[in-house]
């Protein structure tokens, strides 16, 4: 159902927004432990004027990498809704710009078991910090697009 503009963003509000808010709500406690360092993704991908579609396309692609994070079924379901829903709605608005497929992650060097455990914990926290920021940026970017469609 491809009428994001004609229904004043109802597709977004009733599906994407609900899932984004559910995800963010479940991540309320994440933030205080997050490092201040800027993630490379947000240095490179900005929800800027005329580039909203490009940003959301890559953000949706990035979200799919979090679908196997050993999280609850509900969490994964909401992630899937946001990722797939964003891609579908971008196709609706004609904002999507296809790119080359994402490269696979590089293998990490072998570490001792204890070192590995703390590294894994740090990586998981880092991933959750990134995911929370990504969801916030996706939400902001969709709102920016919808404000634009309501103005015109």
């Amino acid at each position: 159902d491809c009428d994001i503009e004609g229904k004043d963003g109802k597709q977004y509000e009733s599906v994407l927004m609900v899932s984004i808010d559910q995800l963010l709500d479940s991540m309320k406690e994440i933030g205080s432990n997050c490092l201040n360092n800027e993630f490379n993704f947000f240095k490179r991908h900005i929800c800027d004027a005329n580039k909203e579609g490009m940003f959301l396309f890559r953000a949706a692609r990035k979200l799919r990498q979090f679908l196997k994070m050993n999280s609850t079924g509900d969490f994964d379901l909401h992630l899937l809704k946001v990722s797939e829903g964003t891609t579908i709605l971008l196709n609706c608005t004609g904002q999507v710009k296809g790119r080359k497929p994402a490269a696979l992650g590089e293998a990490q060097p072998t570490k001792s078991l204890e070192e590995n455990k703390s590294l894994k914990e740090q990586k998981k926290l880092n991933d959750l910090c990134f995911l929370k920021r990504l969801l916030q940026e996706i939400k902001t970017c969709w709102n920016k697009i919808l404000m634009g469609t309501k103005e015109h």
Epitope: N36, E38, R44, I46, D48, F55, P101, A103
Partner: antibody
Framework: QVQLVESGGGVVQPGRSLRLSCAAS????????VHWVRQAPGKGLEWLAA???????DYNVAFSSRFTISRDNSKNTLYLQMNSLRAEDTAVYYC???????????WGQGTLVTVSS | DIQMTQSPSSLSASVGDRVTITCKAS??????????MNWYQQKPGKAPKLLIY???NLESGVPARFSGSGSGTDFTLTISSLQPEDFATYYC?????????FGGGTKVEIK
């Protein structure tokens, strides 16, 4: 429209310090990364440093011991503190707003710094 | 650091000519399916202006006669039909790795 205006350049003696400013307008300054880039007379472009929306910084290690980037979001202003200046630091210094792909999407007009005794 | 080598360093061309500038990186500037290569135009006494970002994307307001291509280490900026206002110096810049680095520039002069 996006506007960046540098100030603080001038003639300074070797070994002295200088602070450059860049006043931003036409966009939500606090949500964007901003950079300093310089260009020596008749030469190419050289990236110095960046500061991100959360305040974290990246430096070209060739300058990190002498140059410090900072920002004041309440004043929509970017700064570059330059210490122990040398003759080879003579250049036009530009501030630039971060763009898609970590490009330099918008530039100021530049401010000339001349290090000379 | 990633070294950027631009060629030629200067060229003479006439209005209407097709101009090609190349940029070679000392290592790949690709990541996660994208190429982090940007192109700028600079006129004497002025600040640089972004033309192309991420190898092939035309910046808003830039004429369609400018195009970018390439991936990995080899990139090209093409001006399909040179206009009088295009006589300037062009720089490539990689943003895949800090420090961000520029090519030495290509000066496009009137023949």
């Amino acid at each position: 429209q996006v506007q960046l205006v540098e100030s603080g350049g001038g003639v300074v003696q070797p070994g002295r310090s200088l602070r450059l400013s860049c006043a931003a307008s036409g966009f939500t300054f606090s949500t964007y990364g901003v950079h300093w880039v310089r260009q020596a007379p008749g030469k190419g472009l050289e990236w110095l440093a960046a500061i991100w929306s959360g305040g974290s910084t990246d430096y070209n290690v060739a300058f990190s011991s002498r140059f410090t980037i900072s920002r004041d979001n309440s004043k929509n202003t970017l700064y570059l503190q330059m210490n122990s200046l040398r003759a080879e630091d003579t250049a036009v210094y530009y501030c630039a707003r971060n763009g898609y792909g970590e490009s330099f999407a918008y530039w100021g007009q530049g401010t000339l710094v001349t290090v000379s005794s | 650091d990633i070294q950027m080598t631009q060629s030629p360093s200067s060229l003479s061309a006439s209005v209407g000519d097709r101009v090609t500038i190349t940029c070679k990186a000392s290592q790949s500037v690709d990541d996660d399916g994208d190429s982090y290569m940007n192109w700028y135009q600079q006129k004497p006494g002025k600040a640089p202006k972004l033309l192309i970002y991420m190898a092939s994307n035309l910046e808003s307001g830039v004429p369609a006669r400018f195009s970018g291509s390439g991936s990995g280490t080899d990139f090209t900026l093409t001006i399909s039909s040179l206009q009088p206002e295009d006589f300037a110096t062009y720089y490539c810049q990689q943003s895949n790795e800090d420090p961000l680095t520029f090519g030495g520039g290509t000066k496009v002069e009137i023949k």
